[in-house]
């Protein structure tokens, strides 16, 4: 088993609002859960955008998600990871 | 994670109903959503409204204008403020612990009956 | 708001039986669905989250399955301690909101 590297990024998307990224890279096996959260609850599924679970060429895999937050509110929202019974939290950088 | 509510379990029509959940073994301020939800009488469930970890509060919208949740970060508590009661808000009032997609943790429940 | 209905209200099964209790939303809920155990006395425990996965502590014996807008909970060996009332929710959209319950007796 190989454990993510999580990251965490944001990027301007409309007046008041911006768009936060969450990246998962090199990790095996390929299942894995990767979910924004507001107040530590799941945003819905319609909310929220998800890449495919790729190779990345080292015999690991990579995906990503993303959802688009009101400008002010980053500190309600964290970036969710479980992977092989281990998980993680991440924050939206400031 | 143990959750225990507490409260009046009589209230007159048109007044305040304010209940307490007492949380141990998990910081309110450490993560999650604090959820109140009621069951009325027939066993129907209705969720109130959280106050997250960041003290950030989300309702529901059919509660809105009477509902306020507040907590005591020093005491590991959060409370309940419902305003202008009826008799259909007699139910059994709960807090639960949302982490992530579901309420994995609830309280026993505290039974509030709306009378004059 | 999301209407989440339980069938059936209400059932009675012998011990050792397999307990099916359905679920169905009026829209697609992409799998945010949980499954509640309510016992006699009023305690509620979570059982099942995310459609399929089991809360730490459950017995086994507890599944659940579905997509879309139907979901199920599926008791494999009913015991007398699984007599209780069982609530479905959906995670969603909010407001988050509850089935009417099944409750399960014992023949």
């Known amino acids: 088993t190989v454990p993510p590297m999580v990251n965490v990024t944001r990027s301007e998307a409309s007046e008041g609002n911006i768009t936060v990224t969450c990246r998962a890279s090199g990790f095996y096996p390929w299942n894995i859960t990767l979910s924004w959260r507001q107040d530590g609850v799941s945003l819905s599924h319609d909310t929220q955008q998800w890449g495919d679970v790729l190779p990345d060429g080292n015999g690991t895999y990579q995906t990503w998600v993303a959802t688009r937050i009101c400008q002010g509110e980053e500190q309600r929202f964290t970036c969710y990871m479980e992977h092989s019974g281990n998980h993680s939290t991440h924050p939206v950088p400031s | 994670v143990q959750l225990q509510e507490s409260g009046p379990g009589l209230v007159k029509p048109s007044q305040s109903l304010s209940l307490t959940c007492n949380v141990t073994?998990?910081?309110?301020?450490?993560?999650?959503?604090w959820n109140w939800i009621r069951q009325f009488p027939g066993n129907k469930l209705e969720w109130i409204g959280y106050?997250?970890?960041?003290?950030?509060?989300t309702y529901n919208p059919s509660l809105k204008s009477r509902v306020s949740i507040t907590r005591d970060t020093s005491k590991n508590q959060f409370f309940l403020q419902l305003n202008s009661v009826t008799p259909e808000d007699t139910a059994t009032y709960y807090c639960?612990?949302?982490?992530?997609?579901?309420?994995?943790?609830w309280g026993l429940g505290t039974s509030v009956t709306v009378s004059s | 708001d999301i209407q989440m209905t339980q069938t059936p209200s209400s059932l009675s099964a012998s011990l050792g039986d397999r307990v099916t209790i359905s679920c169905r939303a009026n829209?697609?809920?992409?799998?945010?669905l949980n499954w509640y155990q309510q016992k006699p006395d009023g305690a509620v425990k979570l059982l099942i989250y995310?459609?399929?996965r089991i809360h730490s502590g459950v017995p086994s014996r507890f599944s659940g399955s579905g997509s879309g807008t139907d979901y199920s909970l599926t008791i494999a060996n009913l015991e007398q301690e699984d007599v209780a009332t069982y609530f479905c929710?959906?995670?969603?959209?909010?407001?988050?909101?509850f089935g009417g319950g099944t409750k399960v007796e014992i023949k």
């Open positions: 106050i997250g970890y960041t003290g950030s509060t």
């Open positions: 929710q959906q995670g969603n959209t909010p407001p988050t909101t």
């Open positions: 073994g998990y910081s309110i301020t450490g993560d999650y959503a």
């Open positions: 829209q697609d809920i992409s799998h945010y």
């Open positions: 995310y459609t399929s």
């Open positions: 639960a612990r949302w982490r992530n997609w579901a309420m994995d943790y």
